[in-house]
């Protein structure tokens, strides 16, 4: 190319279909300057133009030659270029933004634009270019990419953006612009130009304003608020911490905040102040709902369904902002709707769904929803298994007869298709308590009724009973007790009988014991006493209760004595026993020592005694007869403890073994003892008999039986030389070697000679007796021997 | 239990002054905004002044600004209003009342609770 | 500074009925700045609501308070004889703190 001939030679395109080619004009040319453009490849193509561009359609691939001949005043010149589509540049169209509008509630800008897609032929990718610039500034806050598709029909694209700062603080610049990657083109790809700005502004009122108003954020999050102001800010704080300001366009403010910590229930205050003025905002910082924990559904009725949770983790926000739950059932579609206006801690949440008509499998769902978030739950469950049962109501006991009663309750629900397994706890009054267990047809109704037997008669009992379905979910609460007497029956036993002779030996005096209270089965009002022997039978009057002795003038002939309790409703089965007693010449009294609250007596064997042995006990010291108690035990027993409240320590009992055979009684053996030994509580009284220049004789008399509180074993005599009245060491007292003790273990010995002693001396003597309760207390004397002669 | 109580009212002519005390029990007075309102005779609530926890900042209402002045004594617990230049609209009943909430736990600006029972100002010639 | 107006001015009701008492702002007003107090001749006023909706301590909850915006509401489900009183709302988001000029609650 010459020089001053047409130069720089440029070929764009927007749309691949055509080309804009244009030069630089020779220098020197003016206005009157004509070109002649030939494109040439396998044909030759030319046009007249007068300016230094021209558009072609799109030419195929391979070179062409271009030559552009200018035509002026002062001549001609002509250049040659070689045009390939490499050396065209894809430049699109300089976008245009249609709308750009904002939601200043969540601070969120949003943008459409078209992309004219209908000029470009051909499928195309596009990036755009999306700049956010922020104050009257323009300082730059967000730069984006956002890839489309040209599909040759124009196309709106559209993008949103939430910003960080409330978009009421500045004011927001929005401009775009395209990029087209074509894969077919070979040339060059370049950006278009920036649309057009649009701009997004708040117009104040009067009032400062501080924005976001009443936001709920997640804690931990960062926040920008503001103030928009027409006076000077001076200061910003969150909660009753400073902030440092960022300043904005004017006098508006900005403050950012950081992890922000857990508001309290009524949120946390965020201030700016002025001059003269305080402006606030209160911020929410809390949790999306947690997972609900436990979700548990079950029914008391099989009429309606109670859902129950844990809500988890605390939100931290309440009222309005306070998690709302909805429970779902899937396969009917229905839901229910629950709104807490408070939350708290760790309580547990619950619902109710009214149940459904044919329908025991329900799959629920329970979302959580807060403005932060949302959570699920989900159960399947089979209603019909997971009944947990009303308390029981309206209890009550009536009797059928004196060994069976019948219960009856309410259980409000339709539970005409499944079982009960119920549980009664009977209780008597000082007995252990019995569980029984019973299966009930559930019914529709919801009373119940069931018969409970093998009860016993006259009999205070404590009634409760809890249900649960047969396919165990859980028990209900249990029913109030309900105390119930069952009705008399006859006694079921005779008394328990026994006879002594009184001490004259004329009259037989008859006792018995009242009749345990399962035995006398009601109030005992009276006993019948009467005697039989081979020729006649004999009544006494009625004996009322609580009378349980009498007595009966007979001779030596044998007797069966009959005793008999009667109640309101019958008469017991008589008690018998002879009068006669077998005599037994081959009698020894034994000595027998308890174990502290008893006594054990054992024998031997004995076939010949068929109907049972009797212990009968008293206290020795008691005239005759001598009565305390008695107590029966089978024939094949061969020992036997007796215990009793009235057996104090150290008090002698007599004890008497007797044998019954053919109606009557022996006597086998008689043992006086102790339930326990303890030591005698009197020294035994003695006196000097006798005294030498070198002997003294003492004698000393029995303990009385009730002193000696056991069995005397022995007794310790002590002596050694000591005066009265001086500072002398006593006999008892420790570290004496020259003390002598004799163990007198002869219990039936009275006196002691003591010998070799110092004529005119004087002897402290010391007496004191022993049982296997221990030693007794001491009598002491000071005797004087006689001079030697 | 939380209680307020005002003193220090009574007639008093126009132009000249008047110091009104609340005295604060039964909470941590240092921890909360306090406040001023006054109510004339028949008529509404109006607002008149708040002092912050600490003392630092005190707004007023325009129609006292210049003329009364807040302020507290931490260590008495105890709130007072200077009133200076005193005109016959400021007669009223003069409330303290105490921020609903603690600075220290959701900041400033909250609700009025409680309140004392009242301290009658009467500004007459 | 925000100004609320209180209607109706009195409401005359029986004892039993239900009482709605309306606040309106002259500007937006954050439901968390807006209280409805009680006040009763003779004696302070006692807070009933703030943060629009929540009930302050040992409020019977008879007393509801709803409302965002410019429009907020008092509602007493079932008058008894101690709420016949003067209620006002109060907005404390922005200074100057301003009262409305109080709804009277009388017996019919």
């Known amino acids: 190319q010459k020089k001053g001939a047409p130069h720089d030679l440029k070929c764009v395109t927007n749309n691949l279909q055509v080309w804009n080619c244009s030069w630089k004009a020779p220098s020197g040319t003016g206005r009157g300057t004509d070109y002649e453009v030939c494109i040439e490849n396998r044909s030759r193509s030319c046009y007249q133009l007068e300016k230094t561009s021209i558009k072609i359609p799109a030419l195929s691939h391979g070179d062409y030659e271009i030559t552009i001949n200018s035509l002026h005043d002062f001549g001609s010149s002509t250049s040659k270029f070689t045009l390939n589509e490499q050396n065209v540049s894809l430049i699109p169209d300089t976008p245009e933004i249609l709308n750009l509008s904002a939601d200043f509630s969540t601070s969120t800008l949003y943008l459409k634009w078209n992309d004219r897609g209908s000029v470009f032929p051909h499928r195309s990718n596009v990036i755009w270019e999306i700049k956010v610039l922020r104050k009257e500034s323009m300082e730059l806050v967000k730069l984006v990419t956002h890839n489309t598709t040209l599909n040759g029909k124009d196309t709106l694209h559209h993008w949103s953006w939430a910003s960080d700062m409330p978009l009421e603080c500045a004011i927001h610049f929005v401009e775009i612009r395209c990029y087209i990657d074509n894969l077919h083109f070979s040339g060059l790809e370049e950006w278009s130009d920036w649309s057009p700005v649009k701009n997004i502004s708040w117009i104040p009122d009067s009032q400062t304003k501080v924005f976001p108003q009443d936001k709920v954020i997640l804690v931990g999050s960062d926040i920008t608020f503001c103030c928009v102001s027409q006076e000077k800010v001076l200061s910003a704080l969150i909660g009753h911490t400073n902030c440092p300001l960022i300043h904005l366009d004017g006098e508006n403010v900005a403050i950012k905040i950081r992890n922000i910590s857990v508001s309290a229930s009524s949120g946390t205050n965020v201030v700016f102040t002025t001059e003269d003025n305080i402006f606030g905002t209160v911020i929410f910082a809390g949790y999306p709902p947690d997972t609900p924990q436990q979700l548990n559904c079950e029914t008391h009725d099989l009429k309606e369904i109670i859902c129950s949770w844990n809500p988890g983790r605390v939100t931290a926000l309440v009222g309005p902002r306070a998690t709302s739950y909805t429970l779902v059932e899937s396969f009917s579609g229905k839901y229910v709707r629950l709104k807490r206006a408070e939350a708290p801690t760790n309580e547990s949440y619950q619902l109710l769904f009214q149940m459904l008509p044919n329908q025991e499998i329900y799959n629920f769902t329970l979302n959580a929803h807060n403005p932060l978030g949302r959570s699920q739950s989900t159960i399947l469950v089979n209603i019909t298994e997971k009944v947990y049962p009303h308390t029981p109501t309206s209890f009550k006991v009536k009797d059928i007869n004196s060994t069976a009663v019948k219960l009856s309750w309410h259980l409000p629900g339709n539970f005409a298709k499944i079982n009960f397994l119920c549980e009664i706890e009977i209780k008597k009054s000082n007995s252990v308590q019995e569980q029984r267990n019973v299966t009930i047809k559930g019914v529709e109704n919801s009373s119940y009724l069931v018969a409970l037997d093998k009860l016993n008669p006259y009999t205070l009992y404590t009634f409760r009973i809890r249900c649960s379905t047969e396919t165990f979910w859980k028990w209900s609460k249990w029913s109030n007790k309900k105390q119930h007497l069952t009705t008399e029956a006859s006694p079921s036993k005779g008394p328990d009988t026994w006879r002594e002779w009184s001490s004259d030996g004329k009259n037989l005096i008859i006792y018995w014991k009242p009749l345990p209270i399962n035995e006398a089965n009601g109030k005992i009002l009276s006993y019948n006493v009467s005697c039989s022997s081979d020729e006649e039978t004999q009544s006494l009057s009625e004996i009322p209760d609580p009378q349980h002795k009498a007595e009966i003038r007979l001779d030596k002939n044998d007797y069966i004595i009959s005793v008999v309790a009667k109640n309101s409703v019958g008469s017991s089965p008589p008690s018998k026993i002879a009068s006669m007693e077998i005599p037994n010449d081959d009698l020894k009294i034994e000595q027998v020592v308890g174990m502290g609250k008893g006594i054990l007596l054992t024998w031997h064997y004995d076939p010949n005694m068929t109907c049972d042995y009797v212990i009968k006990w008293c206290n020795s010291s008691r005239s005759e007869p001598c009565l305390m108690d008695w107590r029966k035990v089978p024939s094949n027993s061969t020992e036997t403890v007796i215990e009793s409240d009235e057996f104090r320590p150290g008090i002698r009992y007599n004890f008497f073994l007797y044998g019954c055979r053919n109606q009557g009684y022996q006597l086998l053996r008689s043992m006086i003892g102790y339930i326990e030994e303890l030591a005698p509580i009197v020294a035994p009284n003695f006196t000097v008999e006798d005294t030498s220049a070198d002997s003294i004789l003492v004698k000393w008399e029995d303990i009385p039986v009730e002193e000696l509180r056991g069995f005397l074993r022995g007794y310790l005599f002590y002596f050694g030389k000591g005066e009265r009245d001086t500072s002398k060491m006593r006999v008892l007292e420790s570290g004496r070697s020259d003390i002598k003790v004799k163990n007198i273990t002869d219990i039936s010995q009275k006196t002691l000679r003591i010998a070799d002693l110092q004529g005119k001396t004087s002897y402290h003597l010391v007496l004191r007796a022993y049982t296997d309760g221990g030693v007794g207390p001491e009598k002491s004397m000071y005797v004087v021997t006689k001079e030697n002669s | 239990q939380v209680q307020l109580v005002e003193s220090g009212g009574g007639v008093v002519q126009p132009g000249r002054s008047l110091r009104l005390s609340c005295a604060a029990s039964?909470?941590?007075?240092?921890?909360?905004?306090m406040h001023w309102v006054r109510q004339a005779p028949g008529k509404g609530l109006e607002w008149v002044a708040v002092i912050w926890y600490d003392g630092n900042n005190k707004y007023y209402a325009d129609s006292v600004k210049g003329r009364f002045t807040i302020s507290r004594d931490n260590s008495k617990n105890t709130l007072y209003l200077q009133m200076n230049s005193l005109r016959a609209e400021d007669t009223a009943v003069y409330y303290c009342a105490r921020d609903g909430e603690s600075s220290m736990v959701r900041g400033l600006l909250n609700w009025f609770d409680p309140w004392g029972q009242g301290t009658l100002v009467t500004v007459s010639s | 500074e925000i100004v609320l107006t209180q209607s109706p001015g009195t409401l005359s009701l029986s004892p039993g009925e239900r009482a709605t008492l309306s606040c309106r702002a002259s500007?937006?007003?954050?439901?968390?700045?807006l209280a409805w107090y009680q006040q009763k001749p003779g004696q302070a006023p006692r807070l009933l609501i703030y943060?629009?909706?929540s009930r302050a301590t040992g409020i019977p909850d008879r007393f509801s308070g709803s409302g965002s915006g410019t429009d907020f509401t008092l509602t007493i489900s079932r008058l008894e004889p101690e709420d016949f009183a003067v209620y006002y709302c109060q907005q404390y988001g922005s200074s100057p703190f301003t009262f409305g000029p109080g709804t009277k609650v009388d017996i019919k």
């Open positions: 943060g629009a909706s």
């Open positions: 039964g909470f941590t007075f240092s921890s909360y905004g």
């Open positions: 500007q937006s007003v954050s439901s968390s700045y």
